[in-house]
């Protein structure tokens, strides 16, 4: 369950996360498999670990090999894998197949490639984009953040698409390319204005005091790949992370799951330990995209709570 | 309701095995780490086993090499395998509820079966 | 491992008054996110055990406001304000830092 594949280019850049992630404050220790050796944390080595993360910097063929990461959480120490794969770098241009990352496909409408794995890096923008090793030139081409943005798809666009930025670690600076395929759908997708499928408007919810209460934002916005859609909570009428209590969480990463074609996002709001102020607060679910905003309004009240030991 | 019910408890003689089974209901039962704890008779409780949401398995001395512990999510279901059994393992068996294993959510061990009785005797 | 030692082994206590309990861990029970990883549990008899108190001092859902737990380390106290009849049976202090270890029990009975 908690084993992933990671994979790099001697002389590049490569981090890794551990697989089995904990909350920012547990320790993760890191140790090369075979040997059983501690994987040090100090930057002044090539390899080292710094909490959830392991750095190769750069990477040698050498490193790879399976690194085990064992989170310091209450009552376990959990432990994940990471299956690590450095490569030699090819002298031409064909990007292997070993060497690529998840197949993304877009649309006329849509054609946004995430670089992989740059939440990892320390980069600075711009990224470098190229498509079968050229670099891309021409207004077309918008480099924007983390993706790239493709004007007017057309079917010859489909192709293999590297990303190469620079990773900087206390002032030395590492290259990380990463290569994606993108297809071409020629089917014609379309936005809607928003529709919420849960929770329905002025939904009472029911929580039982003291307990973990989750809510989901359900809506979708139309057929194909959508260029913007966001659903999100607020909580009188506050961003969640701006409203300030830790005990209310907004679930990261939003699915984009396609039920009968069209595209809809999930949104899981978190609360946990229901206090009783919980219940006199407004919680808004909110989808949005090019055509507008819609809201729906869920009040809390509070479920007799049921005696399990009796 | 939140549930726990655990079966599979009877006599068995030493060197001998038996299977406990609890059944979970109510909840996500797949998120959380799951847990035994025994109660010898007139005595405390003693921690026996766990299994966390990636079936990582967690076992004290005295057990360890004896039981297994295994869960089935799609049965919303808890096994303990319990081999080479020995007098000192009669107790009443309890499955009970950990903590969140997906969110690191913790509220204490807050649910508990109603226990089975395994007895080892000759 | 981390041994948890209770006392007193039992408490007669006087309904209307308060009681407390004392657990002693054989190591801090602090973990690095802040929280102490100390419960409490009351077995009735007859009855599976039942929480009280989670993280040293947070009471369980439908747990009456009269229990109270405090402390911090390795030293924590369950406090009673006022013992009812009901509360009678074995209280036991768990650490969930590290596995789960038990204290021994205290036996609440009515004088």
């Known amino acids: 369950k908690f084993s992933k594949q990671s994979w790099g280019l001697e002389n590049e850049a490569l981090i890794v996360r551990c697989p089995r992630q904990g909350k920012p404050s547990y320790t993760v220790d890191w140790y090369y498999s075979q040997t059983n050796k501690s994987i040090p944390t100090q930057e002044r080595n090539r390899v080292f670990a710094s909490g959830q993360l392991l750095k190769f910097l750069p990477a040698a063929v050498a490193d790879s090999g399976i690194y085990t990461c064992i989170v310091r959480s209450p009552t376990f120490n959990r432990t994940g894998y990471a299956n690590v794969t450095i490569y030699k770098k090819q002298s031409d241009c064909n990007v292997p197949d070993y060497l690529m990352y998840s197949t993304v496909s877009g649309s006329e409408k849509n054609s946004k490639i995430y670089c992989p794995t740059i939440d990892l890096y320390n980069w600075t923008a711009p990224l470098e984009w190229f498509k079968n090793c050229q670099a891309l030139q021409g207004s077309r081409y918008r480099a924007h953040k983390s993706f790239l943005v493709i004007d007017n798809v057309m079917t010859e666009d489909a192709g293999d698409y590297t990303c190469k930025f620079i990773h900087n670690e206390n002032g030395a600076n590492y290259s990380v390319t990463a290569t994606r395929s993108f297809t071409v759908k020629d089917e014609q997708g379309f936005s809607l204005f928003p529709v919420i499928g849960a929770p329905a408007q002025n939904e009472i919810k029911e929580v039982e005091i003291g307990k973990n209460a989750n809510l989901t934002c359900s809506a979708c916005f139309g057929k194909g790949t959508q260029f913007l859609a966001a659903v999100l909570w607020q909580l009188n009428g506050t961003k969640i992370t701006d409203f300030g209590e830790p005990r209310i969480q907004q679930e990261e990463g939003q699915n984009q799951s396609f039920s009968n074609g069209l595209a809809c996002l999930d949104m899981v709001l978190r609360i946990a330990d229901v206090k009783e102020e919980d219940l006199l607060l407004q919680y808004d679910c909110l989808a949005l995209n090019l055509h507008g905003l819609r809201r729906h309004t869920v009040r809390l009240s509070r479920k007799n709570p049921i005696d399990h030991h009796s | 309701e939140v549930q726990l019910v655990e079966s599979g408890g009877g006599l068995v003689q030493p060197g001998g095995s038996l299977r406990l089974s609890c059944a979970a209901s109510?909840?996500?039962?797949?998120?959380?780490?799951m847990h035994w704890v025994r109660q010898t008779t007139g005595k405390g409780l003693e921690w026996v086993s766990a299994i966390d949401l990636a079936g990582d398995t967690y076992y004290p001395g005295s057990v360890k090499g004896r039981f297994t512990i295994s869960r089935e999510d799609a049965k919303n279901s808890l096994y303990l395998q319990m081999n080479s059994l020995r007098a000192g393992d009669t107790a009443v068996y309890y499955c009970?509820?950990?903590?969140?294993?997906?969110?690191?959510?913790?509220?204490?061990?807050?649910?508990w079966g109603q226990g089975t009785t395994v007895t080892v005797s000759s | 491992d981390i041994v948890m030692t209770q006392s007193p082994l039992s408490l007669p206590v006087t309904p209307g008054e308060p009681a407390s309990i004392s657990c002693r861990s054989s190591?801090?029970?602090?973990?690095?996110?802040?929280?102490?990883?100390l419960d409490w549990y009351l077995q009735k008899p007859g009855q599976s055990p039942q929480l009280l108190i989670y993280?040293?001092?947070n009471r369980a859902s439908g747990v009456p406001d009269r229990f109270s737990g405090s402390g911090s380390g390795t030293d924590f106290t369950l406090n009673i304000s006022r013992v009812e009849a009901e509360d009678v049976g074995v209280y036991y202090c768990m650490q969930a830092l590290q596995t789960l270890t038990f204290g021994g029990g205290t036996k609440v009975e009515i004088k």
């Open positions: 993280l040293g001092s």
């Open positions: 190591q801090s029970l602090l973990h690095s996110d802040g929280y102490h990883y």
């Open positions: 009970a509820r950990g903590g969140d294993g997906y969110n690191y959510d913790y509220y204490g061990i807050d649910v």
């Open positions: 109510g909840f996500t039962f797949s998120t959380y780490d």
